[in-house]
Protein backbone atom coordinates (compact mmCIF):
# COMPACT_ATOMS: atom_id res chain seq x y z
CA UNK A 1 0.00 0.00 0.00
CA UNK A 2 1.40 3.33 -1.15
CA UNK A 3 0.48 7.02 -1.46
CA UNK A 4 -1.32 7.79 -4.73
CA UNK A 5 0.65 8.50 -7.90
CA UNK A 6 0.83 11.97 -9.38
CA UNK A 7 -2.38 13.00 -11.23
CA UNK A 8 -2.27 15.04 -14.45
CA UNK A 9 -4.71 17.70 -15.65
CA UNK A 10 -4.68 16.82 -19.33
CA UNK A 11 -7.44 18.91 -20.90
CA UNK A 12 -9.56 22.01 -20.38
CA UNK A 13 -12.24 23.02 -22.86
CA UNK A 14 -14.88 25.73 -23.15
CA UNK A 15 -17.81 25.62 -25.59
CA UNK A 16 -18.23 29.40 -25.70
CA UNK A 17 -15.92 31.32 -23.29
CA UNK A 18 -18.78 31.41 -20.75
CA UNK A 19 -18.19 28.07 -19.01
CA UNK A 20 -15.36 25.55 -19.05
CA UNK A 21 -14.42 22.08 -17.83
CA UNK A 22 -11.07 20.52 -16.96
CA UNK A 23 -10.29 16.80 -16.78
CA UNK A 24 -7.50 14.94 -15.02
CA UNK A 25 -5.95 11.48 -15.24
CA UNK A 26 -5.46 9.78 -11.89
CA UNK A 27 -2.02 8.43 -11.09
CA UNK A 28 -1.65 4.97 -9.57
CA UNK A 29 -4.05 4.47 -6.68
CA UNK A 30 -1.50 2.91 -4.32
CA UNK A 31 -3.94 0.07 -3.72
CA UNK A 32 -6.20 2.22 -1.56
CA UNK A 33 -9.35 4.33 -2.09
CA UNK A 34 -8.22 7.74 -3.34
CA UNK A 35 -9.93 11.11 -3.11
CA UNK A 36 -9.24 13.80 -5.70
CA UNK A 37 -9.74 17.52 -5.25
CA UNK A 38 -9.02 20.35 -7.65
CA UNK A 39 -7.96 23.71 -6.24
CA UNK A 40 -7.32 26.88 -8.17
CA UNK A 41 -6.55 30.54 -7.90
CA UNK A 42 -6.60 33.28 -10.48
CA UNK A 43 -3.36 34.93 -11.54
CA UNK A 44 -2.71 37.96 -9.36
CA UNK A 45 -4.73 36.37 -6.55
CA UNK A 46 -3.65 34.29 -3.56
CA UNK A 47 -7.13 33.19 -2.46
CA UNK A 48 -7.26 29.44 -3.04
CA UNK A 49 -10.59 28.08 -4.28
CA UNK A 50 -12.02 24.60 -4.59
CA UNK A 51 -13.63 23.14 -7.68
CA UNK A 52 -17.24 24.36 -7.72
CA UNK A 53 -18.70 21.33 -9.54
CA UNK A 54 -17.25 17.81 -9.77
CA UNK A 55 -20.42 16.36 -11.33
CA UNK A 56 -21.30 18.06 -14.63
CA UNK A 57 -18.16 17.07 -16.56
CA UNK A 58 -18.25 13.42 -15.53
CA UNK A 59 -15.59 11.41 -13.66
CA UNK A 60 -12.29 13.13 -12.82
CA UNK A 61 -13.48 16.55 -13.91
CA UNK A 62 -14.16 20.03 -12.65
CA UNK A 63 -16.79 22.21 -14.29
CA UNK A 64 -16.74 25.99 -13.98
CA UNK A 65 -20.23 27.40 -14.53
CA UNK A 66 -20.99 30.89 -15.80
CA UNK A 67 -20.57 32.59 -12.44
CA UNK A 68 -17.09 31.05 -12.00
CA UNK A 69 -15.77 31.84 -15.47
CA UNK A 70 -13.90 35.01 -16.25
CA UNK A 71 -12.47 35.58 -19.71
CA UNK A 72 -9.99 38.14 -18.48
CA UNK A 73 -8.26 35.97 -15.88
CA UNK A 74 -5.70 33.20 -16.08
CA UNK A 75 -6.63 30.28 -13.83
CA UNK A 76 -3.84 28.38 -12.06
CA UNK A 77 -5.07 24.93 -11.08
CA UNK A 78 -3.80 21.79 -9.43
CA UNK A 79 -5.25 18.37 -8.50
CA UNK A 80 -4.53 16.77 -5.14
CA UNK A 81 -4.81 12.97 -4.81
CA UNK A 82 -5.09 11.68 -1.23
CA UNK A 83 -5.32 8.24 0.32
CA UNK A 84 -4.56 6.88 3.82
CA UNK A 85 -0.85 6.71 3.07
CA UNK A 86 -0.41 10.27 1.84
CA UNK A 87 -0.96 12.79 -0.95
CA UNK A 88 0.42 13.80 -4.30
CA UNK A 89 -0.15 16.87 -6.43
CA UNK A 90 -0.36 17.39 -10.15
CA UNK A 91 1.74 20.04 -11.83
CA UNK A 92 0.07 23.45 -11.94
CA UNK A 93 -1.82 24.13 -15.14
CA UNK A 94 -2.36 27.68 -16.38
CA UNK A 95 -5.66 28.12 -18.18
CA UNK A 96 -6.79 31.14 -20.18
CA UNK A 97 -10.40 30.60 -21.26
CA UNK A 98 -9.81 32.53 -24.49
CA UNK A 99 -7.49 29.79 -25.75
CA UNK A 100 -9.41 26.63 -24.78
CA UNK A 101 -12.61 27.15 -26.74
CA UNK A 102 -13.87 24.10 -28.58
CA UNK A 103 -17.27 24.94 -30.05
CA UNK A 104 -20.10 22.54 -30.70
CA UNK A 105 -20.36 21.48 -34.35
CA UNK A 106 -22.12 23.81 -36.81
CA UNK A 107 -25.85 23.23 -37.21
CA UNK A 108 -28.39 22.80 -39.99
CA UNK A 109 -26.03 21.65 -42.72
CA UNK A 110 -28.00 21.72 -45.98
CA UNK A 111 -26.56 20.31 -49.18
CA UNK A 112 -28.07 20.69 -52.66
CA UNK A 113 -27.05 19.99 -56.23
CA UNK A 114 -27.55 23.15 -58.29
CA UNK A 115 -27.78 22.86 -62.06
CA UNK A 116 -28.11 26.36 -63.52
CA UNK A 117 -28.88 26.52 -67.24
CA UNK A 118 -26.12 28.96 -68.08
CA UNK A 119 -23.33 27.49 -65.93
CA UNK A 120 -21.81 24.20 -64.85
CA UNK A 121 -23.63 22.35 -62.07
CA UNK A 122 -22.21 22.51 -58.55
CA UNK A 123 -22.75 21.26 -55.05
CA UNK A 124 -24.02 23.99 -52.73
CA UNK A 125 -23.87 23.75 -48.97
CA UNK A 126 -25.01 26.04 -46.19
CA UNK A 127 -24.88 25.83 -42.38
CA UNK A 128 -25.36 27.83 -39.20
CA UNK A 129 -22.89 28.51 -36.39
CA UNK A 130 -23.39 26.53 -33.16
CA UNK A 131 -26.11 27.89 -30.88
CA UNK A 132 -23.87 28.58 -27.90
CA UNK A 133 -21.66 30.92 -29.88
CA UNK A 134 -22.77 34.55 -30.02
CA UNK A 135 -21.00 36.03 -33.03
CA UNK A 136 -22.71 39.41 -32.59
CA UNK A 137 -20.58 40.29 -29.55
CA UNK A 138 -17.45 40.32 -31.67
CA UNK A 139 -15.70 37.98 -29.18
CA UNK A 140 -15.61 35.26 -31.80
CA UNK A 141 -14.41 34.73 -35.28
CA UNK A 142 -15.39 31.25 -36.39
CA UNK A 143 -13.58 29.46 -39.19
CA UNK A 144 -15.15 26.54 -41.00
CA UNK A 145 -13.92 23.42 -42.72
CA UNK A 146 -15.90 21.04 -44.92
CA UNK A 147 -15.16 17.45 -45.76
CA UNK A 148 -16.89 15.18 -48.23
CA UNK A 149 -16.42 11.77 -49.79
CA UNK A 150 -18.33 9.25 -51.87
CA UNK A 151 -20.17 6.87 -49.53
CA UNK A 152 -17.87 3.92 -50.20
CA UNK A 153 -14.59 5.85 -50.40
CA UNK A 154 -12.01 5.66 -47.61
CA UNK A 155 -10.49 9.10 -48.06
CA UNK A 156 -12.13 12.44 -47.27
CA UNK A 157 -11.65 15.52 -49.42
CA UNK A 158 -11.28 18.57 -47.15
CA UNK A 159 -11.88 22.25 -47.94
CA UNK A 160 -11.24 25.31 -45.82
CA UNK A 161 -14.16 27.75 -46.02
CA UNK A 162 -12.84 30.63 -43.92
CA UNK A 163 -15.62 32.59 -42.19
CA UNK A 164 -18.23 31.73 -44.82
CA UNK A 165 -21.35 29.81 -43.92
CA UNK A 166 -21.89 28.87 -47.58
CA UNK A 167 -19.72 26.90 -49.96
CA UNK A 168 -19.86 25.67 -53.57
CA UNK A 169 -17.91 22.79 -55.05
CA UNK A 170 -17.45 21.60 -58.62
CA UNK A 171 -15.67 18.39 -59.54
CA UNK A 172 -17.74 15.59 -58.11
CA UNK A 173 -18.22 12.05 -59.37
CA UNK A 174 -21.56 11.74 -61.20
CA UNK A 175 -23.96 9.12 -59.90
CA UNK A 176 -22.25 8.85 -56.53
CA UNK A 177 -23.83 9.30 -53.10
CA UNK A 178 -21.69 11.71 -51.04
CA UNK A 179 -21.34 12.28 -47.31
CA UNK A 180 -20.78 15.90 -46.31
CA UNK A 181 -19.74 17.27 -42.90
CA UNK A 182 -18.69 20.64 -41.55
CA UNK A 183 -16.78 21.70 -38.44
CA UNK A 184 -15.68 25.00 -36.95
CA UNK A 185 -13.02 26.55 -34.77
CA UNK A 186 -12.55 29.96 -33.19
CA UNK A 187 -9.54 32.03 -34.22
CA UNK A 188 -7.77 30.88 -31.01
CA UNK A 189 -8.93 27.45 -30.00
CA UNK A 190 -9.80 23.94 -31.13
CA UNK A 191 -11.76 22.40 -33.98
CA UNK A 192 -15.24 21.24 -33.06
CA UNK A 193 -16.32 17.69 -33.75
CA UNK A 194 -17.66 17.18 -37.25
CA UNK A 195 -21.37 17.77 -37.72
CA UNK A 196 -23.55 14.72 -38.39
CA UNK A 197 -23.13 13.58 -41.98
CA UNK A 198 -25.55 14.84 -44.60
CA UNK A 199 -26.01 12.60 -47.63
CA UNK A 200 -26.46 13.87 -51.18
CA UNK A 201 -26.95 11.93 -54.39
CA UNK A 202 -25.02 13.41 -57.32
CA UNK A 203 -27.01 13.03 -60.57
CA UNK A 204 -25.52 10.87 -63.31
CA UNK A 205 -25.53 13.83 -65.72
CA UNK A 206 -23.41 15.99 -63.37
CA UNK A 207 -20.59 17.45 -65.49
CA UNK A 208 -17.11 16.67 -64.13
CA UNK A 209 -14.52 19.40 -63.91
CA UNK A 210 -11.21 18.16 -62.54
CA UNK A 211 -9.30 21.36 -63.10
CA UNK A 212 -11.12 23.75 -60.82
CA UNK A 213 -13.39 23.99 -57.82
CA UNK A 214 -15.75 26.88 -57.47
CA UNK A 215 -16.27 28.71 -54.19
CA UNK A 216 -18.62 31.59 -53.67
CA UNK A 217 -18.43 34.00 -50.76
CA UNK A 218 -21.60 35.45 -49.32
CA UNK A 219 -19.46 38.34 -48.04
CA UNK A 220 -18.51 39.28 -51.60
CA UNK A 221 -22.09 39.90 -52.60
CA UNK A 222 -22.36 36.71 -54.62
CA UNK A 223 -19.16 37.35 -56.57
CA UNK A 224 -17.58 34.03 -57.50
CA UNK A 225 -13.96 33.12 -57.07
CA UNK A 226 -12.14 30.44 -59.04
CA UNK A 227 -9.67 28.53 -56.94
CA UNK A 228 -7.22 26.07 -58.45
CA UNK A 229 -6.31 22.70 -56.92
CA UNK A 230 -2.91 24.17 -55.97
CA UNK A 231 -4.49 27.08 -54.06
CA UNK A 232 -6.86 24.75 -52.27
CA UNK A 233 -3.98 22.59 -51.15
CA UNK A 234 -2.68 25.49 -49.01
CA UNK A 235 -6.00 25.56 -47.12
CA UNK A 236 -6.03 21.81 -46.52
CA UNK A 237 -6.42 21.03 -42.81
CA UNK A 238 -6.31 17.52 -41.36
Amino acid sequence: QLPPGKPEIFKCRSPNKETFTCWWRPGTDGGLPTNYSLTYHREGETLMHECPDYITGGPNSCHFGKQYTSMWRTYVMMVNATNQMGSSFSDELYVDVTYIVQPDPPLELTVEVKQPEDRKPYLWMKWSPPTLIDLKTGWFTLLYEIRLKPEKAAEWETHFAGQQTEFKILSLHPGQKYLVQVRCKPDHGYWSAWSPATFIQIPSDFIMNDEQKLISEEDLGGEQKLISEEDLHHHHHH
Epitope: S37, T39, R42, G44, E45, T46, L47, M48, H49, E50, P52, D53, F64, G65, K66, Q67, Y68, T69, S70, W72, R73
Partner: antibody, heavy 118, light 107 residues
Protein backbone atom coordinates in the same frame (compact mmCIF):
# COMPACT_ATOMS: atom_id res chain seq x y z
CA UNK B 1 -35.49 34.05 -3.32
CA UNK B 2 -31.76 34.06 -2.45
CA UNK B 3 -31.48 34.85 1.25
CA UNK B 4 -29.07 34.78 4.19
CA UNK B 5 -30.38 35.07 7.75
CA UNK B 6 -28.03 35.56 10.70
CA UNK B 7 -28.82 34.75 14.32
CA UNK B 8 -27.08 34.33 17.66
CA UNK B 9 -26.08 37.93 18.40
CA UNK B 10 -26.30 38.96 22.04
CA UNK B 11 -24.93 41.14 24.82
CA UNK B 12 -22.02 39.36 26.52
CA UNK B 13 -19.22 40.23 28.92
CA UNK B 14 -15.55 40.47 27.89
CA UNK B 15 -13.89 37.04 27.82
CA UNK B 16 -17.14 35.20 27.14
CA UNK B 17 -18.06 33.16 24.04
CA UNK B 18 -20.82 33.36 21.45
CA UNK B 19 -21.75 31.35 18.40
CA UNK B 20 -23.29 33.07 15.39
CA UNK B 21 -25.26 31.20 12.75
CA UNK B 22 -26.26 32.06 9.20
CA UNK B 23 -28.88 30.06 7.34
CA UNK B 24 -28.97 30.15 3.55
CA UNK B 25 -31.88 29.59 1.21
CA UNK B 26 -32.63 29.97 -2.49
CA UNK B 27 -29.25 28.83 -3.79
CA UNK B 28 -26.91 25.82 -3.81
CA UNK B 29 -25.11 26.60 -0.57
CA UNK B 30 -22.42 23.93 -0.95
CA UNK B 31 -21.16 25.54 -4.19
CA UNK B 32 -20.36 28.88 -2.61
CA UNK B 33 -17.59 30.28 -0.45
CA UNK B 34 -18.90 32.20 2.55
CA UNK B 35 -17.67 35.02 4.77
CA UNK B 36 -18.33 37.01 7.91
CA UNK B 37 -18.04 40.79 7.69
CA UNK B 38 -18.60 43.13 10.64
CA UNK B 39 -19.41 46.78 11.16
CA UNK B 40 -18.84 48.51 14.48
CA UNK B 41 -21.47 51.15 15.34
CA UNK B 42 -20.91 54.25 13.20
CA UNK B 43 -17.82 52.72 11.57
CA UNK B 44 -16.86 51.11 8.28
CA UNK B 45 -16.95 47.53 7.04
CA UNK B 46 -14.36 45.01 8.20
CA UNK B 47 -13.95 41.54 6.71
CA UNK B 48 -13.58 38.94 9.47
CA UNK B 49 -13.33 35.44 7.98
CA UNK B 50 -13.65 33.30 4.84
CA UNK B 51 -14.46 29.60 4.36
CA UNK B 52 -14.25 27.63 1.12
CA UNK B 53 -17.20 25.66 -0.26
CA UNK B 54 -16.22 22.37 1.39
CA UNK B 55 -14.80 24.00 4.50
CA UNK B 56 -11.23 22.94 3.73
CA UNK B 57 -9.76 26.44 3.46
CA UNK B 58 -10.25 29.19 6.05
CA UNK B 59 -8.87 32.70 6.40
CA UNK B 60 -9.16 35.23 9.25
CA UNK B 61 -8.36 38.87 9.84
CA UNK B 62 -5.35 39.15 12.20
CA UNK B 63 -7.36 40.68 15.06
CA UNK B 64 -9.52 37.52 15.49
CA UNK B 65 -6.97 34.77 14.73
CA UNK B 66 -6.89 32.20 17.51
CA UNK B 67 -10.16 33.46 19.00
CA UNK B 68 -12.74 33.01 16.22
CA UNK B 69 -13.46 29.85 14.22
CA UNK B 70 -15.49 29.77 11.03
CA UNK B 71 -17.26 26.55 10.04
CA UNK B 72 -20.13 25.35 7.88
CA UNK B 73 -22.61 22.50 7.63
CA UNK B 74 -23.54 22.12 3.98
CA UNK B 75 -26.29 19.60 4.74
CA UNK B 76 -27.98 22.21 6.94
CA UNK B 77 -27.11 25.09 4.57
CA UNK B 78 -25.58 26.85 7.55
CA UNK B 79 -22.52 28.96 8.27
CA UNK B 80 -21.17 29.50 11.79
CA UNK B 81 -18.78 31.77 13.64
CA UNK B 82 -17.59 30.55 17.03
CA UNK B 83 -16.34 33.61 18.93
CA UNK B 84 -14.22 33.03 22.06
CA UNK B 85 -12.41 35.45 24.38
CA UNK B 86 -14.63 38.30 23.22
CA UNK B 87 -13.37 41.86 23.64
CA UNK B 88 -15.07 45.25 23.66
CA UNK B 89 -13.67 46.00 20.19
CA UNK B 90 -15.54 42.97 18.79
CA UNK B 91 -18.79 44.89 19.32
CA UNK B 92 -20.36 45.14 15.89
CA UNK B 93 -23.15 44.14 13.56
CA UNK B 94 -22.01 40.82 12.05
CA UNK B 95 -23.05 40.09 8.47
CA UNK B 96 -22.74 36.81 6.67
CA UNK B 97 -21.93 37.34 2.99
CA UNK B 98 -21.73 35.04 -0.01
CA UNK B 99 -18.73 35.21 -2.29
CA UNK B 100 -19.77 34.78 -5.90
CA UNK B 101 -17.82 32.82 -8.50
CA UNK B 102 -15.50 35.71 -9.25
CA UNK B 103 -14.80 36.46 -5.58
CA UNK B 104 -17.12 39.37 -4.88
CA UNK B 105 -19.62 39.67 -1.98
CA UNK B 106 -22.86 39.55 -3.92
CA UNK B 107 -25.41 38.54 -1.27
CA UNK B 108 -25.50 39.83 2.31
CA UNK B 109 -27.66 38.95 5.30
CA UNK B 110 -29.34 41.61 7.44
CA UNK B 111 -26.80 41.17 10.23
CA UNK B 112 -26.88 40.15 13.90
CA UNK B 113 -25.68 42.47 16.66
CA UNK B 114 -22.93 41.42 19.06
CA UNK B 115 -22.30 43.71 22.04
CA UNK B 116 -19.36 43.03 24.35
CA UNK B 117 -19.61 45.10 27.51
CA UNK B 118 -19.13 44.71 31.22
CA UNK C 1 -1.19 43.43 4.39
CA UNK C 2 -2.40 45.62 1.53
CA UNK C 3 -4.09 48.79 2.76
CA UNK C 4 -6.98 50.46 0.94
CA UNK C 5 -7.20 54.24 1.31
CA UNK C 6 -10.37 55.99 0.22
CA UNK C 7 -10.79 59.72 -0.30
CA UNK C 8 -12.50 61.94 0.53
CA UNK C 9 -13.96 60.51 3.75
CA UNK C 10 -17.07 62.61 3.14
CA UNK C 11 -18.40 64.98 0.52
CA UNK C 12 -21.40 67.17 -0.07
CA UNK C 13 -22.66 67.83 -3.60
CA UNK C 14 -25.74 69.12 -5.37
CA UNK C 15 -28.25 67.02 -7.30
CA UNK C 16 -26.96 66.65 -10.86
CA UNK C 17 -23.31 67.09 -9.89
CA UNK C 18 -20.59 64.74 -11.06
CA UNK C 19 -19.05 63.02 -8.06
CA UNK C 20 -15.75 61.12 -8.01
CA UNK C 21 -14.45 58.96 -5.17
CA UNK C 22 -10.92 57.54 -5.25
CA UNK C 23 -9.43 54.41 -3.75
CA UNK C 24 -5.71 53.66 -3.52
CA UNK C 25 -4.14 50.28 -2.81
CA UNK C 26 -0.76 50.11 -1.09
CA UNK C 27 0.31 47.43 -3.62
CA UNK C 28 -0.74 46.36 -7.11
CA UNK C 29 -4.09 44.54 -6.96
CA UNK C 30 -4.58 44.32 -10.75
CA UNK C 31 -8.32 45.00 -11.10
CA UNK C 32 -9.52 42.87 -8.19
CA UNK C 33 -11.56 45.73 -6.78
CA UNK C 34 -15.25 46.08 -5.92
CA UNK C 35 -17.37 49.08 -4.95
CA UNK C 36 -20.28 48.84 -2.49
CA UNK C 37 -23.05 51.27 -1.62
CA UNK C 38 -24.52 51.28 1.91
CA UNK C 39 -27.57 53.43 2.46
CA UNK C 40 -28.33 54.56 6.05
CA UNK C 41 -29.61 51.62 8.12
CA UNK C 42 -29.31 49.20 5.18
CA UNK C 43 -27.14 46.30 4.08
CA UNK C 44 -24.21 46.98 1.70
CA UNK C 45 -24.97 46.41 -1.98
CA UNK C 46 -22.51 45.51 -4.71
CA UNK C 47 -22.26 48.19 -7.41
CA UNK C 48 -19.14 47.32 -9.38
CA UNK C 49 -16.75 44.37 -9.60
CA UNK C 50 -13.44 43.93 -11.42
CA UNK C 51 -12.89 47.69 -11.06
CA UNK C 52 -15.29 48.61 -13.86
CA UNK C 53 -17.99 45.95 -14.34
CA UNK C 54 -21.39 47.39 -13.43
CA UNK C 55 -23.67 44.90 -11.70
CA UNK C 56 -27.04 44.09 -13.17
CA UNK C 57 -29.71 46.57 -12.07
CA UNK C 58 -27.24 49.29 -11.05
CA UNK C 59 -28.03 52.65 -12.73
CA UNK C 60 -25.69 53.59 -15.57
CA UNK C 61 -24.79 56.88 -13.87
CA UNK C 62 -22.38 54.79 -11.76
CA UNK C 63 -19.07 53.84 -13.33
CA UNK C 64 -15.74 52.52 -12.14
CA UNK C 65 -12.26 52.71 -13.57
CA UNK C 66 -8.65 52.05 -12.70
CA UNK C 67 -6.17 49.21 -12.37
CA UNK C 68 -3.12 48.43 -10.30
CA UNK C 69 -3.15 50.79 -7.32
CA UNK C 70 -5.48 53.64 -8.30
CA UNK C 71 -9.24 53.35 -8.76
CA UNK C 72 -12.21 55.69 -9.05
CA UNK C 73 -15.97 55.47 -8.65
CA UNK C 74 -17.89 58.14 -10.53
CA UNK C 75 -21.53 59.16 -10.23
CA UNK C 76 -22.14 61.15 -13.40
CA UNK C 77 -25.25 62.96 -12.14
CA UNK C 78 -25.91 62.74 -8.40
CA UNK C 79 -29.48 61.82 -7.44
CA UNK C 80 -31.18 62.13 -4.01
CA UNK C 81 -31.34 58.32 -3.74
CA UNK C 82 -27.53 58.14 -4.01
CA UNK C 83 -27.13 59.43 -0.41
CA UNK C 84 -25.05 56.64 1.10
CA UNK C 85 -21.59 55.59 2.20
CA UNK C 86 -19.47 54.04 -0.54
CA UNK C 87 -16.77 51.47 0.11
CA UNK C 88 -14.06 50.05 -2.10
CA UNK C 89 -12.82 46.54 -1.36
CA UNK C 90 -9.99 44.44 -2.75
CA UNK C 91 -10.49 40.72 -3.21
CA UNK C 92 -7.29 39.25 -4.62
CA UNK C 93 -6.00 37.91 -1.31
CA UNK C 94 -6.85 37.61 2.38
CA UNK C 95 -7.52 39.80 4.27
CA UNK C 96 -10.25 41.05 1.91
CA UNK C 97 -9.72 44.66 2.94
CA UNK C 98 -12.32 47.43 2.67
CA UNK C 99 -11.51 51.10 2.29
CA UNK C 100 -12.57 53.43 5.10
CA UNK C 101 -15.68 54.60 3.23
CA UNK C 102 -16.88 57.86 1.67
CA UNK C 103 -20.08 59.41 2.98
CA UNK C 104 -21.98 61.23 0.22
CA UNK C 105 -24.52 63.89 1.19
CA UNK C 106 -26.71 66.30 -0.76
CA UNK C 107 -26.11 70.04 -0.37
Amino acid sequence: EVQLVESGGDLVQPGESLRLSCTASGFTFNSYEMNWVRQAPGKGLEWVSYISSSGGTKYYVDSVKGRFTISRDNAKKSLYLQMNSLRADDTALYYCARLNGVDVFDIWGQGTMVTVSS
Amino acid sequence: DIQMTQSPSSLSASVGDRVTITCRASQDIFNYLAWFQQKPGKVPELLISAASTLQSGVPSRFSGSGSGTYFTLTISSLQPEDIATYYCQRYNSAPLTFGGGTKVEIK
